[in-house]
Interface confidence: low
């Protein structure tokens, strides 16, 4: 079953490579179990960069080694991405599944275009 | 299509402990999702865990600090070491694999397994 997610459109990542985006879900159901995955479009090409699955209420957590972070608070999932650079400029699509109950229920957002600028190395100082 | 066969249950005195195993066999999609979920009589059936390799593995917080989810290397098996356990943690518990993908490829159930906790 299909369900509207919500996303904004453009994002630009700060100086240190981290870019922030609230992923929001219209929950037809009471779920107890959810799970988001965060795909990235380029070139054609899609890609997982992360996922995790929470329960309602609880906190949102990824793997020790994910560039992900986030939190959760009802229907909208906030989320960090950390450690960008430029080429990883493009389209991130936030998937949101509630795994149970049933029924499944499917939203996947249009996606949040991420742009990644590298900071200029800095000058070399006298110093 | 994917069969689940749960083992490792029976009856235990509260304070005791259980380790339930489910192995999945046939033609898996990966990434895929395994949990387990547990059905009490006269109740809805609850996740009480769920172990992703993509994901973080969560628990039910009923069963926090004192069941532990793990699968073996080849993620074919998945296993719940069920430590301290009370007589409300009676009931049939169910594994269940999930394949994902941009969709939900397939759900699938074992039959269950009965857990009774009483002396």
């Known amino acids: 079953k299909a369900m509207h997610v919500a996303q904004p459109a453009v994002v630009l990542a700060s100086s240190r490579g981290i870019a922030s985006f609230v992923c929001e879900y219209a929950s037809p159901g009471k779920a107890t179990e959810v799970r988001v995955t965060v795909l990235r479009q380029a070139d054609s090409q899609v890609t997982e960069v992360c996922a995790a699955t929470y329960m309602m209420g609880n906190e949102l957590t990824f793997l020790d080694d994910s560039i992900c972070t986030g939190t959760s608070s009802g229907n909208q999932v906030n989320l960090t991405i950390q450690g960008l650079r430029a080429m990883d400029t493009g389209l991130y699509i936030c998937k949101v599944e509630l795994m149970y109950p049933p029924p499944y229920y499917l939203g996947i957002g249009n996606g949040t275009q991420i742009y990644v600028i590298d900071p200029e190395p800095c000058p070399d100082s006298d110093f | 299509e994917v069969q689940l066969q749960e083992s490792g249950g029976g009856l235990v005195q509260p304070g005791g402990s259980l380790r339930l195993s489910c192995v999945a066999s046939?033609?898996?999609?990966?990434?895929?999702?395994m949990g387990w979920y547990r059905q009490a009589p006269g109740k809805q059936r609850e996740l009480v865990a769920t172990?992703?390799?993509?994901?973080?593995?969560i628990y039910a917080d009923a069963v926090k600090g004192r069941f532990t989810i793990s699968s073996d290397n080849d993620e074919n098996t998945v296993y719940l070491q069920m430590n301290s356990l009370k007589p409300e943690d009676t009931a049939v518990y169910y594994c269940?694999?999930?394949?994902?993908?941009?969709?939900?490829?397939?759900?699938?159930w074992g039959q269950g397994t009965q857990v009774t906790v009483s002396s």
């Open positions: 269940n694999l999930k394949e994902l993908g941009i969709y939900l490829r397939g759900d699938y």
């Open positions: 046939g033609s898996i999609f990966r990434p895929y999702v």
């Open positions: 172990n992703s390799k993509g994901g973080s593995t």
